[in-house]
Interface confidence: medium
């Protein structure tokens, strides 16, 4: 009798009430593997969740988070709120970045501004809570009497090493 059940394909279940006939999964349920004795209830994407993929007889629904939230956990089991640029999400909610740090995204944590002097450069544009500093030419390049025969190197993007 066990062999009869193993013949039931995904999308069906082995119905003990009907002499182990393979019955289709009822509406709003699925079986992703063969030989199942029951079908699993489809996940419902509601509230803060929205449907990314509808449930089928062989696969569960997949959820995303609505605008203003992003997924956390396995298979988007939770939705975490977005913050504004210039903020980071702590366990107690969105908090502004501390002075000297920035976040240019709606998620993630605040990161320290680039230290231009480590590369021998000067600060061309000051950093803000939302943006990193922009590094410019070295202070020596800007001093009076410095040769202007060669233009200063272009400012590199933060986080990229010089070639």
């Amino acid at each position: 009798l066990q062999d009869l059940c193993s013949n039931c394909p995904a999308g069906t279940f082995c119905d003990n009430n009907r002499s182990q006939i393979c019955s289709p999964c009822p509406p709003n349920s699925f079986s992703s593997a063969g030989g199942q004795r029951t079908c699993d209830i489809c996940r419902q994407c509601k509230g803060v969740f929205k449907t990314r993929k509808e449930c089928s007889s062989t696969s569960n629904a997949e959820c995303d988070c609505i605008s203003g939230y992003h997924c956390l956990g396995a298979e988007c089991s939770m939705c975490e709120q977005d913050c504004k640029q210039g903020q980071e999400l702590t366990k107690k909610g969105c908090k502004d970045c501390c002075f000297g740090t920035f976040n240019d995204q709606k998620r993630g944590i605040c990161r320290p501004w680039t230290n231009c002097s480590l590369d021998g450069k000067s600060v061309l544009v000051n950093g803000t809570k939302e943006r990193d500093v922009v590094c410019g030419p070295s202070p020596a390049d800007l001093s009076p009497g410095a040769s202007s025969a060669t233009p200063p190197a272009p400012a590199r993007e933060p986080g990229h090493s010089p070639q």
Epitope: L72, E80, E88, L89, T90, K91, K92, G108, I109
Partner: nanobody
Framework: EVQLLESGGGLIQPGGSLRLSCAAS????????MTWVRQAPGKGLEWVST????????YYADSVKGRFTISRDNSKNTLYLQMNSLRAEDTAVYFC?????????????????WGQGTTVTVSS
Amino acid sequence: EVQLLESGGGLIQPGGSLRLSCAASGFTFSSFAMTWVRQAPGKGLEWVSTISGSGDNTYYADSVKGRFTISRDNSKNTLYLQMNSLRAEDTAVYFCAKEDTAVASDYYYNIDVWGQGTTVTVSS
């Protein structure tokens, strides 16, 4: 494989009590802080409580302070959340989570493992 399995959720009347458990496996339980987080229907994640690896330090969200108690039994690899004086607004899916250090962090980004969640419904 690191796993967290919550249990103890259910339907409870306002003013009632429930105790949630989270059975941990696959890691040295006492070496890591543990956290309870919840998600109410139609809302985002809300941090509930965190306990250090040793169990000496506990932290609570203002919304549950004085009503909920977090604890852990490191000999049984189990985390608990005792919930008293339950209110309708406590209705949520409760997730237990492992932090990546022994001390509590301010961030969700220090959480590296999540449980699947257990549903608590507070209704008369």
